[in-house]
């Protein structure tokens, strides 16, 4: 009886694992083995596929074969007993195009209200993704174990910290990788769960902001308690993208080590041009807080995005505000290359009730004011470019009294 050649051959490639699966064409015939040959593009001869010779099952692994993953290859299979079937040729394919991204490795660390997620490619030193290691991005799904309500977080890198969580609560998550340059989305990792710790005695500092004053950066933050010391650290933002490296060498800002105020001032030349992460920690001598949320700090944007300078012309029922270019040291105006939007906050001097106006124009009218009343105004600039998404700090408040009645014309 002639042996029929096997059918429906499937090639599954996950990371560097090359798996072949096929169907027996004749279940009634026992003791049949299967063998594969392969052929590279531009070659006439067929070569025996190591790992896939005389296979008794309907699956084989040819991961040991050192292929150029960007080069097209062709496979063929036949059944063997006393005689052999004809060859069945599989459609040619390029391994890289066919490959799927496997589940990443996930390592979790817990704080009281945050979880640190370290993500590594599932296959260390992968040949398949050797040229794409730095292009991996990840997305995750996280949920409280008790509720199951899922939150998705897209476009994260090999280290990500999730904040604003509840203490003593179990969170579960799963992560998948993506190579957006090749339109590839990977498979999810197994689910990992971790319980956040009991609430820490000292909360982390909050609302960290960087501004520029003269040739210095001014870093400010808020803190709940007095009589604390603080330290500030920085890290190159690109280091979060480094696959497989989970040693982050945060550096001290020398002028911001053991400071006793909720701000510190350091020269602009501490940082070369680039994007950095900054974080702040508080200590009372006995206890230490966890680190604050990490803020992104772009020296290029920070250098130009200074608080606006403005003049006020007071009328009886309104202010006319004229916004000008901010001044650098030496009183020279700063050239702003980016379109800006202005946020103007004003309030009656005797009240805390603030009102807000957002304007693209540099001349703004603040309406509906009371005559002979002192109002205070502060303003800040925002970039209109979504990618930059940066705000200046607020200018110092300027307070002016409105004129007596009927001077509004």
């Amino acid at each position: 009886k002639n042996l029929k050649s096997p059918q429906k051959v499937e090639v599954d490639i996950i990371d560097d694992n090359f798996i072949l699966r096929w169907n027996r064409s004749d279940e009634s015939v026992g003791n049949v083995t299967f063998s594969f040959d392969y052929q590279k593009t531009g070659m006439d001869n067929w070569i025996k596929l190591s790992g896939c010779q005389n296979i008794t099952s309907t699956k084989c692994n040819f991961s040991s074969l050192k292929l150029n993953v960007y080069e097209e290859i062709k496979l063929r299979i036949r059944a063997e007993k006393e005689n052999t079937s004809s060859w069945y040729e599989v459609d040619s394919f390029t391994p890289f195009r066919k490959a799927q991204i496997g589940p990443p490795e996930v390592h979790l660390e817990a704080e009281d209200k945050a979880i640190v997620i370290h993500i590594s490619p599932g296959t260390k030193d992968s040949v398949m993704w050797a040229l794409d290691g730095l292009s991996f991005t990840y997305s995750l799904v996280i949920w409280k174990n008790s509720s199951g309500v899922e939150e998705r977080i897209e476009n994260i890198y090999s280290r990500h910290k999730i904040y604003k969580l509840s203490p003593e609560t179990t969170y579960c998550l799963k992560v998948k990788a993506a190579l957006l340059t090749s339109w590839k989305i990977g498979v999810y990792s197994p689910v990992h769960c971790i319980k956040t710790t009991v609430e820490n005695e000292l909360p982390p500092p909050e609302n960290i902001e960087v501004s520029v004053q003269n040739q210095n950066y001014v870093l400010k933050w808020d803190y709940t308690y007095a009589n604390m010391t603080f330290q500030v650290q920085w890290l190159h933002a690109f280091l979060k993208r480094n696959p497989g490296n989970h040693l982050y060498k945060w550096k001290q800002i020398p002028d911001c080590e053991n400071v006793k105020t909720t701000q510190c001032v350091f020269p602009q030349n501490v940082f070369q041009k680039g994007i950095y992460l900054l974080r702040v920690q508080a200590s009372d001598g006995n206890n230490t807080s966890f680190w604050s949320e990490e803020i992104k700090f772009d020296t290029e944007i920070q250098a130009f995005l200074l608080p606006p300078v403005f003049n006020i012309r007071s009328l009886s029922d309104s202010f006319h505000i004229y916004i000008g270019a901010p001044k650098q040291s030496g009183n020279t105006p700063v050239i702003q290359d980016y379109p800006l939007i202005y946020e103007i906050i004003f309030w009656e001097n005797t009240s805390n009730a603030e009102r807000k106006i957002i304007e693209k124009k540099t001349d703004v009218t603040v309406p509906n004011l009371k005559p002979l009343t002192v109002y205070c105004v502060k303003a800040r600039a925002h970039t209109m470019d979504e990618k930059l998404n940066k705000s200046s700090v607020f200018s110092d408040a300027v307070c002016e009294k409105t004129k007596p009645g009927n001077t509004s014309k």
């Epitope: 390592h107 979790l108 660390e109 817990a110 704080e111 009281d112 370290h118 971790i194 710790t197 009991v198 820490n200 005695e201 490296n245 989970h246 040693l247 060498k249 550096k251 001290q252 006995n286 206890n287 230490t288 966890f290």
Partner: antibody, heavy 118, light 107 residues
């Protein structure tokens, strides 16, 4: 494979200084931290400090501040720990250890016994 | 500095026993705790990091758990080669600190 090989045992007089070396192989020291930990006879482990071989930045335990100096020579993949004003309580085995992923001391040297005796 | 207190300091047990060593921190250290095993005349050997992650090559009978201020190292079924001294260490803040050690002896 990763290896940390430390210099040999030393006997020092009180008030003197000792410099212990730790030569690394199998990895690039610039990508890691290098820590020093000591252990007095029959006692527990005590962290002394660490150096970042990339830029020579150091962190010392307050107990040793002013007495310890950690340095490195990246051309020979060697880190050094110098302890000055030695006293008898400094008699201990001194270990270097690599600080790797997740800030963990994952590989250790064989230890160097420093004896301080008059 | 963060104090770590291990208990017990000494522990006698037999091959096949299940043993648990605890480590208490003087303040919340998240999950930034590491466990080492040390045998006489040898350097410490890393067993567990980030409270519960077992180092590649370490037998599965070793497990770690805990977070915040309380941590445990469990050996599910003692083997003759497990008799040694065990140390916990926190890596949450400088200066890094160690527990005083737990000496595990054969009963």
């Amino acid at each position: 494979q990763v290896q940390l090989v430390q210099s040999g045992a030393e006997v020092k007089k009180p008030g003197a200084s000792v410099k212990v070396s730790c030569k690394a192989s199998g990895f690039n020291i610039k990508d890691y931290y290098m820590h020093w930990v000591r252990q007095a006879p029959g006692q527990g482990l005590e962290w002394m400090g660490r150096i970042d071989p990339e830029d020579a930045e150091t962190k010392y335990a307050p107990k040793f501040q002013g007495r310890v100096t950690m340095t490195r020579d990246t051309s020979t993949s060697t880190v050094y720990m110098e302890l000055s004003s030695l006293r008898s309580e400094d008699t201990a085995v001194y270990y270097c250890a690599r600080g790797g992923n997740f800030y963990v001391m994952d590989y250790w040297g064989q230890g160097t016994l420093v004896t301080v005796s008059s | 500095d963060i104090q770590l207190t291990q208990s017990p300091s000494f522990l006698s047990a037999s091959v096949g026993d299940r043993v648990t060593i605890t480590c208490k921190a003087s303040q919340n250290v998240g999950t930034n705790v590491v466990w080492y095993q040390q045998k006489p005349g040898k350097a410490p050997k890393l067993l567990i990091y980030s409270a519960s992650y077992r180092v590649s090559g370490v037998p599965s009978r070793f497990s770690g758990s805990g977070s915040g201020t309380e941590f445990t190292l469990t050996i599910s079924s003692l083997q003759p080669e497990d008799f040694a001294t065990y140390y916990c260490q926190q890596k949450n803040n400088y200066p890094y600190t160690f527990g005083q050690g737990t000496k595990l002896e054969i009963k």
